[in-house]
């Protein structure tokens, strides 16, 4: 296994609809043709997998049908979008990139993006 640098923004604020997007960029040492991208959430020293996708260079990222993530790739950049976020989902979201093919295998882990999610205030009842 060889190490690889992965860059991602330090902070992102989710939209009022609970959608957060960020770019995950990796410094590929060669021409990878198969890449696996995983988003992990770290909270209270526990790490859980949010979503993952394996894609061939030049093709779309395909997450599972029930995934809360979508994404697109362009060169060594992956544009990730996480949907359905609520205030309780605020936390550190880490981008992990694995170059699966051709050998050798490379693993890169970003420092994480702190995603802040603020639940929208309910509209007050109005009397007319």
């Amino acid at each position: 296994c060889k190490a690889m640098h992965v860059a991602q923004p330090a902070v992102v604020l989710a939209s009022s609809r609970g959608i957060a997007s960020f770019v995950c960029e990796y410094a590929s040492p060669g021409k990878a043709t198969e890449v696996r991208v995983t988003v992990l959430r770290q909270a209270d020293s526990q790490v859980t997998e949010v979503c993952a996708a394996t894609y061939m260079m030049g093709n779309e990222l395909t997450f599972l049908d029930d995934s809360i993530c979508t994404g697109t790739s362009s060169g060594n950049q992956v544009n990730l979008t996480i949907q359905g976020l609520r205030a309780m989902d605020t936390g550190l979201y880490i981008c992990k990139v694995e170059l699966m093919y051709p050998p050798p295998y490379y693993l890169g882990i970003g420092n994480g993006t702190q995603i802040y999610v603020i639940d929208p205030e309910p509209c007050p009842d109005s009397d007319f």
Epitope: C1, V47, A52, T54, I94, K96, E98, Y101, L107
Partner: nanobody
Framework: EVQLVESGGGLVQPGGSLRLSCAAS????????MGWYRQAPGKQRESVAT???????DYADSVKGRFTISRDGAKNTVDLQMNSLKPEDTAVYYC?????????????WGQGTQVTVSS
Amino acid sequence: EVQLVESGGGLVQPGGSLRLSCAASGNIFSRYIMGWYRQAPGKQRESVATITPGGNTDYADSVKGRFTISRDGAKNTVDLQMNSLKPEDTAVYYCNARGSSGLSMSTYWGQGTQVTVSS
């Protein structure tokens, strides 16, 4: 915890064929590179063939055209079809799974199965 169990080894004559199988606990093929390695007496362990989650395969030069790696996601097995076997293919063959789990690198090995090519 990933467990790998190999089977299919044995004694075969030069020019013969064998099919090795590796049973994995759980469906790990979507996240791990699966591979077969071998270690001959007095030699270092070497990679024979690998298959990625996307189905890409890679072979050692010494086995290209003779060995074929494949996987069955439904059965959670990775097979190595070995044809035109030579005495120099004699070794203990190990199944391997490598990739990452959480924030760390993971590598798992089976216990190995002996392949002997001799007349």
